[in-house]
């Protein structure tokens, strides 16, 4: 189904993404509802994810996400994180939306989701340095696993953006 056809009743919406990939949802009412992600984004649960191939600082990565009506990834569940890991390249590191602005080890998610120490995925001996105030997902070979690492925010890395699915 063409995006232009889906948009017949949505003409007032300001568009950032010109092409959406949509899945029809079974709705109890007569109207058909479509659940969409922008083209080239990954779909999981109620969200869409964009995995960058360009490197930028954490601050610029956050703005790059904002330009796409998204924000840096906020990890809410183990399942969400495992899905993301499946789509990352092991030789790269990826900024997420977790930072420690004051260097006091007061971690904050960009969307104000409370930071829960009991559901974190730090690599062993991380976080390691209060001057490293931004978090990346990276892969370590020993032991072989993905996890979180604190890094300098001004060092360029890839990133993961997240947005809620678009419903038509």
């Amino acid at each position: 189904q063409k995006y232009s056809q889906l948009l017949e009743k949505k003409t007032t919406k300001e568009l950032v993404h010109t092409t959406l990939e949509c899945v029809k949802k079974n709705m109890p009412v007569e109207e058909t509802a479509w659940s969409c992600c922008p083209k080239n984004w990954k779909s999981f649960s109620s969200n869409c994810y964009f995995i960058s191939t360009e490197s930028a600082s954490w601050q610029d990565s956050e703005k790059d996400c904002a330009r796409m009506e998204a924000h840096l990834l906020v990890i809410n569940t183990q399942e969400e994180q495992d899905f993301i890991f499946q789509n990352l390249q092991e030789e790269s590191a990826y900024f997420v939306g977790l930072s420690d602005p004051e260097g006091q080890r007061h971690w904050q998610w960009v969307d104000q989701t409370p930071y829960n120490e009991s559901s974190t995925f730090w690599h062993p001996r991380e976080p390691s340095d209060p001057n490293e105030r931004c978090v990346v997902l990276n892969f370590r070979k020993s032991p072989k696993r993905w996890g979180w690492n604190d890094v300098n925010c001004l060092g360029p890395q890839r990133s993961v953006c997240e947005m809620m699915k678009i419903h038509l």
């Epitope: 600082s57 601050q59 703005k63 930072s99 602005p101 105030r133 925010c153 001004l154």
Partner: antibody, heavy 119, light 107 residues
Framework: QIQLVQSGPELKKPGETVKISCKAS????????MNWVKQAPGKGLKWVGW????????TYVDDFKGRFAFSLETSASTAYLQINNLKNEDTATYFC????????????WGQGTTLTVSS | DIQMTQSPASLSASVGETVTITCRTS??????LAWYQQKQGKSPQLLVY???TLADGVPSRFGGSGSGTQYSLKINSLQPEDFGNYYC?????????FGGGTKLEIK
């Protein structure tokens, strides 16, 4: 407390070179970008560009590409602005300013360095 | 590049009055906007960031508002120390340009 202390006033002739310093204290230098701002006499503020204090990568506004150069002495928490082949229109006060951690707005400023270029 | 149009260029007001300075941008900057105050012979000082958040130590008579392409700085009950120059600046995309400035003078 956080401070940015700049070098003193400079009087130069056209064609000469000047190097202005900005020494930071009270915070971890490599965690915040350093910006440079120009203010000609009686005029407004113009952003010259910034230097990434972690990677050393400079970014210059188009109007200031060529003769302007940013550099760092990280061990001394100091940023530098060098202007080559000085022209009369470079006469201005130059400010260094720290870029905020998350949004880049300029949260701390140096006191300014007055540069006068005159033959 | 995003252009910044600040108005008025100058403004005369009396102590106790309320004044508003506006900044219009050529594109949506999503609240990535700061306001600075500069006194004669001094360096600028941050007043407001993210369009509406007051910087530490800034009196509550200052207030920022706006969204999209239209932003304003309001100063209630002007005090003698409020007179000087005011500048807006965006941080949405490089170059991070300043507005032309507003000179606030005592009437």
């Amino acid at each position: 407390q956080i401070q940015l202390v700049q070098s003193g006033p400079e009087l130069k002739k056209p064609g000469e070179t000047v190097k202005i310093s900005c020494k930071a204290s009270g915070y971890t230098f490599t965690n915040y970008g350093m910006n440079w701002v120009k203010q000609a006499p009686g005029k407004g503020l113009k952003w010259v560009g910034w230097i990434n204090t972690f990677t050393g990568e400079p970014t210059y506004v188009d109007d200031f590409k060529g003769r302007f150069a940013f550099s760092l002495e990280t061990s001394a928490s100091t940023a530098y602005l060098q202007i080559n082949n000085l022209k009369n229109e470079d006469t201005a006060t130059y400010f260094c300013a720290r870029g905020n951690f998350r949004y880049y707005y300029f949260d701390y400023w140096g006191q300014g360095t007055t540069l006068t270029v005159s033959s | 590049d995003i252009q910044m149009t600040q108005s008025p260029a100058s403004l005369s007001a009396s102590v106790g009055e309320t004044v508003t300075i506006t900044c219009r941008t050529s594109g949506n900057i999503r609240n990535y906007l700061a306001w600075y105050q500069q006194k004669q012979g001094k360096s600028p000082q941050l007043l407001v960031y993210n369009a509406k958040t007051l910087a530490d130590g800034v009196p509550s008579r200052f207030g920022g508002s706006g969204s999209g392409t239209q932003y304003s700085l309001k100063i209630n009950s002007l005090q003698p120390e409020d007179f000087g120059n005011y500048y807006c600046q965006h941080f949405w995309s490089s170059p991070y340009t300043f507005g032309g400035g507003t000179k606030l003078e005592i009437k």
